[in-house]
Amino acid sequence: GELETSDVVTVVLGQDAKLPCFYRGDSGEQVGQVAWARVDAGEGAQELALLHSKYGLHVSPAYEGRVEQPPPPRNPLDGSVLLRNAVQADEGEYECRVSTFPAGSFQARLRLRVLVPPLPSLNPGPALEEGQGLTLAASCTAEGSPAPSVTWDTEVKGTTSSRSFKHSRSAAVTSEFHLVPSRSMNGQPLTCVVSHPGLLQDQRITHILHVSFLAEASVRGLEDQNLWHIGREGAMLKCLSEGQPPPSYNWTRLDGPLPSGVRVDGDTLGFPPLTTEHSGIYVCHVSNEFSSRDSQVTVDVLDPQEDSGKQVDLVSAS
């Protein structure tokens, strides 16, 4: 006869491990007992369980409540046992010793591998600002057994670096994603992907990038110079910019206070029916927590009675 077992049994933390040991005997052979022991190198054998043809299952005190026989029907030549709720400390070498009649004793070893799936965590780096050099966008850490694989999935251009820390029964892997921040990255997803044999599918953690920036400011509304004449209604100037975080707008007049009747509505400056009093230099001030920008325009309200055309100068300053 001969023993049938597995070289390696792999189980995920918390699952039940079936330790197989089947005696394929000749006709008339009987199994008297199957003794299971843990036999890690450098340590003495630690008895696990005894399956006896007459006495039944004995579980050693160290494994009380954790070792069972597989559910019926059972073959009397099957010495397999179930190790309930596998923990990392169960990982190691096991031996089944089968005493048969009349063939004598047989033994076989297997290795129990307990996979510890990782619980990854993603930590964003410092605030990203346009104009910075190579900056840490995020780091992703996952610890498991065996060591997990940590990669990144993103459309954003960047560089990665990984490091690994080995513990007694596991390994922690940390991967960092570095980039040169630009406004085009704002709102883009950066996804940490963790792969591990104990996971049915990759674990993914997504971080949305936030890059602080402030675009140059410009003023719209003076494109058609002929519209800026005395008596015109609905004239307005609009300040154009964009930023992260969204900027706030402030209007001032460089050569004096804003004329009465001029309404400030965020990025828009609304005028009452135009008079020559509305001529002047207007400044749009755009700011957010990252930066500030200015854009100024000169408004020259045209008197239709005069022959001279309206002159408009646009000046932008930062």
């Epitope: 006896h52 299952l57 004995h58 005190p61």
Partner: antibody
């Protein structure tokens, strides 16, 4: 025919010592675990100690641990129980017994006692 | 330690009677249970091992049953030589422990 014969019992004062012997014959002594079991007068049976075939594994009842020592000499087919620091509550008939050999090389369980000696009386009294 | 509780502690019966003695373990012991017979002034004698296996040379009127925690010794037809004290013993763990005994007396 399997035979187990105990000797060495007697009267001893509290704190004293005795060495019991058990001579085995009629079987291959070195193939079996052996045990000592005692029975106080008018009381039930109490397991005392067991020893593996080679003498490499020994088990003791908590009540005698540190005071009694089990040993064997396979060349003489003899089992021993060295009893020190004897107390009045150790007074009993001491039996040596052979363990049934149907569990192979597994120390966590004991097996039934299929052959017993006639017993030797140990009396601890001042 | 595993406690073994026998009942009854004593019983009176007549020759030919069917006698049943029970033994309960404080925790599961599979079939790691033996029954012994002891007559006054004599050493115990193994009757049943593995809860239900008859030891060689023991009359077939003796039988055992049970597994786990509850066990029974039955004498199908009591004979004069059966009047004695009976002990159960678990050998699932060290220390092996005995029941307190059941004395079978003549009615």
């Amino acid at each position: 025919e399997v035979q187990l014969v105990e000797s060495g019992g007697g009267l001893v004062q509290p704190g004293g010592s005795l060495r019991l012997s058990c001579a085995a014959s009629g079987y291959s002594f070195s193939d079996y675990w052996m045990s000592w079991v005692r029975q106080a007068p008018g009381k039930g049976l109490e397991w005392v100690s067991s020893i593996k075939q080679t003498g490499g594994v020994k088990h003791y009842a908590d009540s005698v641990k540190g005071r009694f020592t089990i040993s064997r000499d396979n060349s003489k087919n003899t089992l021993y129980l060295q009893m020190n620091s004897l107390r009045a509550e150790d007074t009993a008939v001491y039996y040596c017994a052979r363990e049934y050999s149907d569990v192979v090389d597994y120390v966590s369980v004991r097996t039934p006692l299929d052959y017993w000696g006639q017993g030797t009386l140990v009396t601890v009294s001042s | 330690d595993i406690q073994m509780t026998q009942s009854p502690s004593s019983l009176s019966a007549s020759v030919g009677d069917r006698v049943t003695i029970t033994c309960r373990a404080s925790q599961g012991i599979s079939s790691y249970l033996a029954w012994y017979q002891q007559k006054p002034g004599k050493a115990p004698k193994l009757l049943i091992y593995a809860a239900s296996s008859l030891q060689s040379g023991v009359p077939s009127r003796f039988s055992g049953s049970g597994s786990g925690t509850d066990f029974t010794l039955t004498i199908s037809s009591l004979q004069p030589e059966d009047f004695a004290t009976y002990y159960c013993q678990q050998h699932y763990t060290t220390p092996p422990t005995f029941g307190q005994g059941t004395k079978v007396e003549i009615k």
